[in-house]
């Protein structure tokens, strides 16, 4: 079997809402993955599990099941959304994210994703980690790759 390549492309959009009373931030973050099947047979993308970390704390998790089948030598782009919550010990961020005196309220989030593919009963897992900028102060749609955090800090692939 040849490789199945998973490439984390970046944040596609981030939609933000607040609970003023509880100083809580809700961020719905949609990410984009490219999955390439280098084989001469179809593979099934069985599930995608993702989590988002802020300051080493997991603030959101998501799991998608039975996603798609990728044909031989084909590539598919897949979007997945992770609902995240910034509250309690991190409520100090509420003040930053809602500060009207600044235009962009970028925070650095670590995106972790694991893709499980299957073919002929064989299962394979591929994981990626990326640091991304996300604006927690307004709804934002990103050009792919636009939210990338300094490459120098990216973990080695």
């Amino acid at each position: 079997p040849r490789s199945i390549d998973v490439k984390y492309i970046g944040v596609k959009s981030a939609y933000v809402s607040y609970d003023v009373q509880k100083r809580t931030i809700y961020l719905n973050i949609t990410n984009t993955l490219n999955i390439t099947n280098n084989n001469y047979y179809s593979v099934e993308v069985e599930n995608i599990t993702a989590q988002v970390q802020f300051s080493k704390t997991v603030i959101g998790k998501a799991r998608l099941n039975n996603i798609t089948i990728i044909g031989p030598l084909d590539m598919k782009q897949i979007d997945y959304t992770v609902p995240t919550v910034i509250a309690e010990e991190m409520s100090y961020m509420y003040d930053f994210c809602t500060l009207i005196s600044i235009k962009v309220h970028n925070i650095v989030l670590m995106m972790q994703v694991t893709v499980t593919t299957t073919y002929f009963g064989h299962s394979e897992q591929i994981s990626q980690e990326r640091y991304q900028y996300v604006d927690c102060g307004r709804n934002t749609t990103y050009q792919l790759g636009q939210s990338e955090y300094l490459n120098v800090l990216q973990p080695q692939q």
């Epitope: 609970d19 003023v20 009373q21 509880k22 100083r23 809580t24 919550v85 409520s91």
Partner: antibody, heavy 119, light 112 residues
Amino acid sequence: QVQLQQPGTELVKPGALVKLSCKASGYTFTTYWIHWVKQRPGQGLEWIGNINPSNGNTKNNERFKTKATLTVDKSSSTAYMQLSSLTSEDSAVYYCVRGDYYGTSYPFWGQGTLVTVSS
Amino acid sequence: DVVMTQTPLSLPVSLGDQASISCRSSQSLVHSNGITYLHWYLQKPGQSPKLLIYKVSNRFSGVPDRFSGSGSGTDFTLKISRVEAEDLGVYFCSQSTHVPYTFGGGTKLEIK
């Protein structure tokens, strides 16, 4: 230390209005929500609403929407609650309360103002 | 509105005994941010209520460790491991998950 000073009593006539004050000290006034709570003699506690002193935004219990108006004066670190069209049902102790950082529990209470509605 | 039901209404105890007060809410108190905003207060005669326990099980500063809170969802309990004279008064549970915030009817802790 945190203090919330309220006048002890207010005697008002039915149909009139009263404006209760709550002077805060010992902390940054604009950082914490101020809540108002009603307690009728020998009865339980009822949340009236709260106000964000930094911008004046309020959240009211629907039951008190037409009864209570919450305001603040940042310059004197004082919160106010105006009660209108008073009836005997409004006779109660009214507490002003400072919320915690999240505005959800009430660590600091004023001594309460006893409002007596009587002709 | 969320109805908070406390039992018992009155709780006669001997000093040194353990006391347990139950508080039940008409709907779950788990907020969409995952936190349960259930608190306990003690009101002594002629005084303002005082915060004892916040967010189910966290003791407020200065509150003795004989006070403990537990529970989840809709069922909550306040326990006093060894009742002392200064613990007598009316205990209220309160929820601030849903607006309007509401209180239980109170439980009077008194000497047997």
